[in-house]
């Protein structure tokens, strides 16, 4: 029976050109984590295997760094990084747990435009 729960960073935003940490945490279970997959809605970004360590997909290896912990750091963000990200925890004996994060990458000018309309 699956008793665990996944906590995630939820909906997050970051500026174009910056970096962001995607983080999930599995709690309330004694199941052993054998592997964590990080996926976008269309592709696999990275795998952290308990025995084999990290594997970053070749198309992301220049912009994705493992960690901290079982999380994932996305660097040099572009607006095309906006979307859903899923952490998939493979555990024994529970099975798989899935967490969802929505990342919105903003043009850096958005923050500047916002500042212009602030009342002094």
């Amino acid at each position: 029976m699956m008793t665990g729960t996944i906590e995630t960073t939820g909906n997050i935003s970051a500026e174009k050109g910056g970096s962001i940490i995607l983080q999930c945490h599995l709690s309330s279970t004694t199941a052993q984590v054998t592997q964590v997959n990080w996926e976008q809605q269309d592709q696999l970004l990275a795998i952290c295997n308990a025995d084999l360590g990290w594997h970053i997909s070749p198309s992301f290896k220049d912009r994705v760094a493992p960690g901290p912990g079982l999380g994932l750091t996305l660097q040099s963000l572009t607006v095309n990084d906006t979307g859903e990200y899923f952490c998939i925890y493979h555990t024994y004996p529970d099975g798989t747990y899935t967490g969802r994060i929505f990342l919105e990458v903003l043009e850096s000018s958005v923050a500047e435009h916002g500042a212009r309309f602030q009342i002094p």
């Epitope: 996926e39 809605q41 269309d42 607006v79 095309n80 990084d81 906006t82 979307g83 859903e84 929505f102 919105e104």
Partner: nanobody, 118 residues
Framework: EVQLVESGGGLVQAGGSLRLSCAAS????????MGWFRQAPGKEREWVAT????????YYADSVKGRFTISADNAKNTVYLQMNSLKPEDTAVYYC???????????WGQGTQVTVSS
């Protein structure tokens, strides 16, 4: 402008099944990521399931995994949510949503009520 219309909700006993449909019009259906969300009374809207634009990947919230199945029929411009082994805690208004790749969900249906009685 994409329009989404849900159907298939209703009242069902615990352990029963329902199939929700979401018909899309006004856009190129196969270019959108589609999702189902739900909102129970007094609670925040929560994500239920996602299917990518090609239909090759599906994702589920842990609370519905193994019971719910999301699928899409590109020929009919329709996404489905097959809900089996329903529980009272599945009672909510279910919303279908669509988003282009690299964008947030910006198109939402009006919702369909699902009530599961014990």
């Amino acid at each position: 402008e994409v329009q989404l219309v849900e159907s298939g909700g209703g009242l069902v006993q615990a352990g029963g099944s329902l199939r929700l449909s979401c018909a899309a019009s006004g856009g190129t259906f196969r270019s959108y990521v589609m999702g189902w969300f739900r909102q129970a009374p007094g609670k925040e809207r929560e994500w239920v399931a996602t299917i990518n634009s090609s239909g090759s990947r599906t994702y589920y919230a842990d609370s519905v995994k193994g019971r719910f199945t999301i699928s899409a029929d590109n020929a009919k411009n329709t996404v489905y949510l097959q809900m089996n082994s329903l529980k009272p805690e599945d009672t909510a208004v279910y919303y279908c949503a669509a988003r282009p790749n690299y964008r947030d969900y910006e198109y939402w249906g009006q919702g369909t009520q699902v009530t599961v009685s014990s």
